[in-house]
């Protein structure tokens, strides 16, 4: 058993039929010595008396808010949560496996630049009685500070008969060094509590591996005289690290016909303009990627040829 | 050329070669997420590689103030990786494919290090760790780790030279 926060404790249980469970001793936080009784949740049934209560925790019915009283007055509370371990593996019931980029990916994180700011998100089908707490650091043995905000519900999607909820959190490295080569990964830890179930999820990454620039901005077309060619121009996204002479991007320009089956013409360039042939009803799209490190491409910025 | 005394390197040449190094490093180990190398235990391997750290002056301001600190750190790293790529980690079993970009990568590391430090000038270099993995699978894992680490290193070096070519060239 360990303390998650004040008066909230996590009991780690091997979860299998007829498991013996864990013996837990609760102590009433009071100078009083006698006349103390214990109850669980809203029930008025007295579970025991005395300053300490010894319980065998085997299942969710044994978890909950234990309260010690004296003469009708509440003295203190202890909330017991369960962390299930099945076949040696901690349960992951609360969050959905996003399966990208690999199986057992529960947390996904992205950064728009090298400033040390990043966003992580996760999915669940659970809509109520759910809380998240996020902590992060750079490195684990001698951790350096990363400050995370509160997790918020960022999207709600309908998946068949069920809804799926996306939560996200923003974190910022306290002393970020955008130009340095990272040697210690960022660690992100999410505590999830649904009713009386506790679970924790972790992710470890370098900022450079989760970079995904915003799409190029101000995408414009300039027809060239007496030609089917157009000059496409764009700018670095505002959110990208500066100076651009140091934090450079590379770009992919694509001409795509109306039909998805039509052949796509693609040009790669380090410049912020390119000359392409504009076909009728086609559109021109541009996306960006770090020039020197192959992290994710941005989403496409698009304009119609006409 | 970057002479220890402090004259400027051939920024544009260094820029071109470092960008080529980036391309080669990624073609040598293109599978991002092929395996999470941090899950495989970091042993003494990549802990010993020279990283370009915050105080090394490789940021835009540090380069403007005095690029020598940064160039020396980059040089150290290039020599280190050049030695690693020439060691039995890469020459031993399992053999690299004949068209593997590792050979080109090795040569380009050497080329860039020579651009930074011509013969007769000596910056101190970092001692290469004695890594002699006994099993072929250990060697393979070590190659992946080294190449992943090299990708990060050459990306920073390429940014330095691109910025230098754009802002510090005479």
């Amino acid at each position: 058993i360990w303390e998650l926060k004040k008066d909230v404790y996590v009991v780690e249980l091997d979860w299998y039929p007829d498991a013996p469970g864990e013996m837990v001793v609760l102590t009433c936080d009071t100078p009083e010595e006698d006349g103390i009784t214990w109850t669980l949740d809203q029930s008025s049934e007295v579970l025991g008396s005395g300053k300490t209560l010894t319980i065998q925790v085997k299942e969710f019915g044994d978890a909950g808010q234990y309260t010690c009283h004296k003469g009708g007055e509440v003295l203190s509370h202890s909330l017991l949560l369960l962390h299930k371990k099945e076949d040696g593996i901690w349960s992951t019931d609360i969050l959905k496996d996003q399966k990208e980029p690999k199986n057992k990916t529960f947390l996904r994180c992205e950064a728009k630049n090298y400033s040390g700011r990043f966003t992580c998100w996760w999915l669940t089908t659970i809509s109520t009685d759910l809380t998240f707490s996020v902590k992060s650091s750079r490195g684990s043995s001698d951790p350096q500070g990363v400050t995370c905000g509160a997790a918020t519900l960022s999207a709600e999607r309908v998946r068949g008969d069920n809804k799926e909820y996306e939560y996200s959190v923003e974190c910022q490295e306290d002393s970020a060094c955008p130009a340095a080569e990272e040697s210690l990964p960022i660690e992100v830890m999410v505590d999830a509590v649904h009713k009386l179930k506790y679970e924790n999820y972790t992710s470890s990454f370098f900022i450079r591996d989760i970079i995904k620039p915003d799409p190029p901005k101000n995408l414009q077309l300039k027809p060239l005289k007496n030609s089917r060619q157009v000059e496409v121009s764009w700018e670095y996204p505002d959110t990208w690290s500066t100076p651009h002479s140091y934090f450079s991007l590379t770009f992919c320009v694509q001409v795509q016909g109306k039909s998805k089956r039509e052949k796509k013409d693609r040009v790669f360039t380090d410049k912020t303009s390119a000359t392409v042939i504009c076909r009728k009803n086609a559109s021109i799209s541009v996306r960006a990627q770090d020039r020197y490190y192959s992290s994710s491409w941005s989403e496409w910025a698009s304009v119609p040829c006409s | 050329r970057a002479v220890p005394g402090g004259s400027s390197p051939a920024w544009t040449q260094c820029q071109q070669l470092s960008q080529k190094l980036c391309t080669l490093a990624w073609s040598a180990h293109p599978l991002v997420g092929h395996m999470d190398l941090r899950e495989e235990g970091d042993e003494e391997t990549t802990n010993d590689v020279p990283h370009i750290q915050c105080g090394d002056g490789c940021d835009p301001q540090g380069l403007r103030d005095n690029s020598q600190f940064c160039l020396q750190r980059i040089h150290q790293g290039l020599i280190f990786y050049e030695k690693l790529l020439g060691s039995d980690i890469f020459t031993g079993e399992p053999s690299l494919l004949p068209d593997s970009p590792v050979g080109q990568l090795h040569a380009s590391l050497l080329g860039l290090s020579q651009l930074l430090q011509p013969e007769g000038h000596h910056w101190e270099t970092q001692q290469i760790p004695s890594l002699s993995p006994s099993q072929p699978w250990q060697r393979l894992l070590l190659r992946f780790k080294i190449l992943r680490s090299l990708q990060a290193f050459v990306a920073v070096a390429a940014r330095v030279f691109a910025h230098g070519a754009a802002t510090l060239s005479p």
């Epitope: 969710f60 019915g61 089908t125 809509s127 109520t128 009685d129 | -």
Partner: antibody, heavy 117, light 108 residues
Framework: QSVEESGGRLVTPGTPLTLTCAVS????????MIWVRQAPGEGLEWIGI?????NTYYATWVKGRFTISKTSTTVDLKMISPTTEDTATYFC??????????????WGPGTLVTVSS | FELTQTPSSVEAAVEGTVTIKCQAS??????LSWYQQKPGQPPKLLIY???KLATGVPSRFSGSGSGTQFTLTIGDLECADAATYYC???????????FGGGTEVVVV
Amino acid sequence: QSVEESGGRLVTPGTPLTLTCAVSGFSLSDYTMIWVRQAPGEGLEWIGIISSSGNTYYATWVKGRFTISKTSTTVDLKMISPTTEDTATYFCARGSGAYISDYFNVWGPGTLVTVSS
Amino acid sequence: FELTQTPSSVEAAVEGTVTIKCQASQSIDSWLSWYQQKPGQPPKLLIYAASKLATGVPSRFSGSGSGTQFTLTIGDLECADAATYYCQSYYDVNAGYGFGGGTEVVVV
């Protein structure tokens, strides 16, 4: 601590109807409330809940046919455009207070709604 | 999400025992309650958290199970136990909520 439904009557299809659940002996700001219905000779079917903070959650089949709202002492169920399939006894119940998704330990006697032309 | 109750109807003698099963289509941990309903009356809570007896309910009623399989057992049957019994999952309103189809208990 009690709850009591009212407003059930005979209506023609398409005529909106609002059922009211009056509560006494407890505060709606402490408990989840649920509306459940039971067609003649059938089982219990949950319609929706309103949490202590006023958030509403509906069963997937509801699809905008009902809305739940509350005041300080009442919980309303509005039937937007009833059909004959909505003929049932409608129950209001109070949660235990432990959770939003809760079990229910205080039930009203129910109010009968008949939808017929 | 589905809660399947079996059997739909059961007949038992006074002083006998009845077992009703409730199966969830996914794990709901122990977030299951049982209700008793008599004709013309609202449901009455018997069991919550799969096995905890509600206030004032005789100990002849007991609940067990967790995950997806749950059981309500009524021992030492009385005529007053003739009613329809419903299980209810309250895991989450989106990811596992609702009532079972009901089991009619006839006491002979």
